[in-house]
């Protein structure tokens, strides 16, 4: 069972400092961007991460949503990333969700973060290259230390 | 730098409750769980319990489930721990230790450590 | 509650040896496991979490492997400040519980 909380307006980064936004084509993507572009790019920049009680605190469990037209929450329907237009529910009945990640922190390091599936349990969001684009995915945790699974949260409010 | 402070030692009678207060500074306080680890003369770790202070609610081991109560004032970044019908098992050095976002997946800051003798 | 059984409860060595410590779970904790040092009248110090992953400042000769329910600690040349006990902790339920620990003493 997960009750919300409160929410915050962040901007999320890969460890490569690049920023993560929503595109024209509602996918998420990661990009060099100055403070400024940061900025300009408003709101595809901002995310809304709702924080949520669990009744099993392994983690702080969140959604995360951008406000364009509408609002969109960030999915991983069978393992695949994708936004979804929806308002983060207040309540949800059940210990797994495919909008629920539990974010949690790196030990000595408070700004590093990593969210893992509610739904997929080893599985996280990560940066990968794909051509030109830097995509947000859900991957398995394979390797000691994977930095493509790290990002940093700065809040906006 | 993250540091933990506990209150000082403490000499209790069987039957009667004791208190230790943690203050937390140098890191965000309502979002990181604290938890309460005792270690009696000799023996081993034992996790006893925690909270999350964004959370309100504590989370406790069952052994001591009806016995120990664990509080956190945001206001002042304090985390507390009260055990009641104290015995004499219960001496040991109680350390509180700042876990991780949200949850008790590491203990990385701990407390110097709070001595309780419960002794008649 | 999952328990955690360390074994060897103690053992002696030199400087220079290599050492290894074993933590068994009771049930299936994937890689939800940490391993702290503990000297005498200190408080404990996280040196490997998430069962491999070294602590940032925690010298490379402290590693940790396995998954499942069998994991090690190993320390591959021990020195002289390395003498202490060690525990392993599992967190794979929001009750988390500590293995009774193994002392590393010099022979």
């Known amino acids: 069972y997960f009750g919300k909380l409160e929410s915050k307006l962040s901007v999320i980064r890969n460890l490569n400092d690049q920023v993560l936004f929503i595109d024209q084509g509602n996918r998420p993507l990661f990009e060099d961007m100055t403070d400024s572009d940061c900025r300009d790019n408003a709101p595809r920049t901002i995310f809304i991460i709702s924080m949520y009680k669990d009744s099993q605190p392994r983690g702080m469990a969140v959604t995360i949503s951008v406000k364009c037209e509408k609002i969109s929450t960030l999915s991983c329907e069978n393992k695949i990333i994708s936004f979804k237009e929806m308002n983060p529910p207040d309540n949800i009945k059940d210990t797994k969700s495919d909008i629920i990640f539990f974010q949690r922190s790196v030990p000595g390091h408070d700004n590093k973060m990593q969210f893992e599936s509610s739904s997929y349990e080893g599985y996280f969001l990560a940066c990968e290259k794909e051509r030109d684009l830097f995509k947000l995915i859900l991957k398995k945790e394979d390797e000691l230390g994977d930095r493509s699974i790290m990002f940093t949260v700065q809040n906006e409010d | 730098q993250v540091q933990l402070v506990q209150s000082g030692a403490e000499v209790k009678k069987p039957g009667s409750s004791v208190k230790v207060s943690c203050k937390a500074s140098?890191?965000?306080?309502?979002?990181?769980?604290i938890s309460w680890v005792r270690q009696a003369p000799g023996q081993g770790l034992e996790w006893m319990g925690g909270i999350i202070p964004i959370f309100g609610t504590a989370n406790y081991a069952q052994k001591f489930q009806g016995r120990v109560t664990i509080t956190a004032d945001e206001s002042t970044s304090t985390a507390y721990m009260e055990l009641s019908s104290l015995r004499s098992e219960d001496t040991a050095v109680y350390y509180c230790a700042r876990g991780g976002y949200g949850g008790y997946y590491y203990f990385d800051y701990w407390g110097q450590g709070t001595l309780v003798t419960v002794s008649s | 509650d999952i328990q955690m059984t360390q074994s060897p409860s103690s053992l002696s060595a030199s400087v220079g040896d290599r050492v290894t410590i074993t933590c068994r779970a009771s049930q299936s904790i994937s890689n939800r496991l940490n391993w702290y040092q503990q000297k005498p009248g200190k408080a404990p110090k996280l040196l490997i979490y998430k069962g491999s992953t070294l602590q940032s400042g925690v010298p490379s000769r402290f590693s940790g492997s396995g998954s499942g329910t069998d994991f090690t600690l190993t320390i591959s040349s021990l020195q002289p400040e390395d003498f202490a006990t060690y525990y392993c902790q599992q967190h794979y339920v929001w009750s988390t519980t500590f293995g009774q620990g193994t002392k590393v003493e010099i022979k």
């Open positions: 140098g890191g965000t306080f309502s979002t990181f769980s």
